[in-house]
Interface confidence: medium
């Protein structure tokens, strides 16, 4: 049956899926706040452009009866459930905002003729790559694999003079949604990361990880994991670590490293943290005041989703083009729009580009310092601290394979 879009005659709506299962355990009121703040900005921007139109959001809540685990791993049915609701209501907006879980996005994409754009704050997995009408506003796993390969290969920096081609990956299955899919992409045999490495082994047990830290026969000095410092501490504790071990801790959506008076705990000295450069204005905006540092990015992605909708609306209306066309549905990519905290760039496949930041712990100050940045848009690593006060020998990152000489 045909679903009509509330998307013409000066009235434009965005349908926001409010799912109990979301990529981050975020109260739905906070998501609503972000959406409403975004709508206010969009209305102002359209008015300033001389476009006298109405813009609203319709929130679609799942009943949570069948699947109320609040966990993305059980989200497949919930997305379809919401699609059924849209189908029964026979109406939706110009754009669908949500879902954020990889399973539900993938399933919705499989089971529907998406003639309208879908914006997601999440959908991190490789299975959501290269979808023609899907836009992802939080760094997907593909972007992480590109950084890691680029960094592994780099060998011409003052602090990294060896190319790496090996790695352990710690993945125990209890990770958050973002981490689950990031590590999944590193584990997948078909992924870019796997293709480019000569050795890769996934460690699934705590004991396996703990043993590697001092194992003289280890096959790599590099361990990739995902989570926050507390997660690492629970796993590593105060165990001794061989001097040429490098732990890469992926913690993209966590601003805590940049807060004033943060001191890096001693167990972080062998660790490089991969995170994102945080926005400035997020710290005191009304919608993020009650959010923890980890939740800001999720709420911001919703807000930016609304601003993207507004940007595309403005572009099409100014050009006198129809909103309910395949052209509109496929237009949410290969562009830069004015986000809440500055310009937001989407690549050719509608995935957000960002600046990733690799941090190290200064042995002098016990502070996190920026070692380098990585621009996902141009796939380029830029050194920042050219003389880091590392724990590693000679202020250089070690080789990924220890030369043990004749045995």
């Amino acid at each position: 049956s045909q679903v009509s879009q509330n998307c013409h005659n000066g009235s434009y709506e965005i349908s926001v899926l409010m799912m109990d299962n979301s990529a981050f355990a975020e109260p739905l009121e906070n998501v609503e706040d972000a959406v409403n703040e975004g709508l206010e900005i969009v209305r102002g921007r359209l008015q300033n452009a001389g476009l006298n139109v109405t813009v609203n959001a319709s929130f679609m809540y799942s009943d949570g009866l069948i699947h109320n685990s609040g966990d993305c791993r059980s989200s497949t049915c919930e997305g379809l459930d919401l699609l059924r609701k849209i189908s029964n209501a026979k109406r939706m907006g110009c754009v669908l905002m949500g879902p954020s879980c990889t399973y539900s996005t993938f399933q919705m994409y499989l089971d529907t003729e998406l003639s309208y754009p879908m914006i997601s704050a999440g959908s991190f997995g490789l299975s959501c790559d290269y979808k023609e009408t899907l836009t992802r506003l939080m760094s997907p796993a593909r972007k992480l694999t590109y950084f890691l390969v680029n960094f592994w290969k780099t060998n011409d920096l003052p602090f990294k003079t060896y190319s790496w081609s090996t790695s352990y990956v710690y993945k125990n299955g209890t990770e958050s949604e973002d981490c689950f899919w990031y590590l999944n992409a590193l584990e997948a045999s078909v992924s870019y990361f796997s293709h480019e490495l000569s050795f890769k082994l996934v460690l699934r047990q705590d004991k396996e990880f703990q043993d590697i830290l001092m194992d003289h026969n280890r096959k790599s000095n590099v361990i990739v994991m995902c989570g926050d410092p507390e997660f690492l501490y629970k796993l590593k504790g105060d165990r001794a670590v061989a001097e040429d071990i490098v732990i890469i801790l992926v913690d993209l959506f966590n601003d805590q490293y940049f807060e004033d008076n943060v001191t890096a705990p001693d167990y972080m000295k062998n660790v490089l943290v991969l995170t994102r450069s945080p926005g400035n204005s997020l710290l005191n905006s009304s919608f993020s005041r009650n959010l923890s540092p980890t939740k800001r990015d999720f709420a911001l992605a919703y807000l930016n989703g609304i601003l993207l909708f507004g940007h595309m609306l403005k572009t099409f209306l100014e050009n006198g083009e129809n909103i309910t066309t395949p052209k509109f549905a496929h237009a949410f990519r290969n562009l830069t729009f004015e986000g809440y905290d500055g310009p937001v760039t989407l690549d050719d496949w509608g995935d957000v580009d960002s600046t990733m930041v690799l941090l190290y712990t200064s042995v002098d100050t016990k502070k996190y310092k920026v070692l380098l940045t990585y621009d996902t848009h141009v796939n380029q690593t830029n050194p920042v601290d050219m003389s880091p006060t590392f724990t590693w020998k000679n202020s250089k990152l070690p080789n990924d394979i220890t030369d043990r000489g004749p045995q």
Epitope: F258, N280, D385, S387, P388, S395
Partner: antibody, heavy 122, light 110 residues
């Protein structure tokens, strides 16, 4: 006070090499980097590269790789820059400067040497 | 490389007036809320002297007549009021990526 004393003017033939020095005093030499900057008459400033005496690590502008080699002697608190295969394009004033880092991790230049004039002529 | 474009290339000011020099970067030079742009003054026959670091922080010993502002890609050095001693070439420098200087702005007195 913090000072960077550079060696005297150099006159060299095309194809030759010169080694300029920059002696630091008034601060802990190994706690900072030393950067080198070129200024040609009627032109602006061009960044050549940096050396971090504590580790001996160097960082070059691609344009000067193969042209300039940076070294440092911790015992005498002196940084050196050797320029080789000189041409008339290398005639310029060369400055050394102290590179200071911040919590963000970037480096900028707070104290400068007096400059060394290099003239390449046959 | 990041290109820094300074304008104007030269500036003739009356004593006591306000001089503003612009430095525009070809891409953002901000990192974690910090603007990695620095301003230098070079007088004839002298080495450059640091005036302002990180866009707006006045270096110790530099007169308060000098101030800096801006963020991301657009930065301004302001001298107010201009004095005789300010005749020099002013350069901006970015330390966000491989270091680059602006082309310089020559300040003269009318």
């Amino acid at each position: 006070q913090v000072q960077l004393q550079q060696s005297g003017a150099e006159l060299a033939r095309p194809g030759a090499s010169v080694k300029l020095s920059c002696k630091a005093s008034g601060y802990t030499f190994t706690s900072y980097g030393i950067t080198w900057v070129k200024r040609r008459t009627g032109q602006g400033l061009g960044w050549i590269g940096e050396i971090y005496p504590r580790s001996g690590n160097t960082y070059y502008n691609e344009k000067f790789k193969g042209k300039a080699t940076l070294t440092a002697d911790k015992s005498s608190s002196t940084a050196y820059m050797e320029l080789r295969s000189l041409t008339s394009e290398d005639s310029a004033v060369y400055f050394c400067a102290r590179a200071i880092t911040t919590v963000v991790g970037d480096w900028y230049f707070d104290v400068w040497g007096t400059g060394t004039t290099v003239t390449v002529s046959s | 490389d990041i290109v820094l474009t300074q304008s104007p290339a030269s500036l003739a000011m009356s004593l006591g007036k306000r001089a503003t020099i612009s430095c525009r970067a070809s891409e953002s030079v901000s990192l974690i809320g910090t603007n990695l742009i620095h301003w230098y003054q070079q007088k004839p026959g002298q080495p450059p002297k640091l005036l302002i670091h990180h866009a707006s922080n006045l270096e110790a010993g530099v007169p308060a007549r000098f101030s800096g502002s801006g963020s991301r890609t657009d930065f301004t050095l302001t001298i107010d009021p201009v004095e005789e001693d300010d005749v020099a070439i002013y350069y901006c420098l970015q330390s966000r990526k491989i270091r680059t200087f602006g082309g310089g702005t020559k300040l003269e007195i009318k």
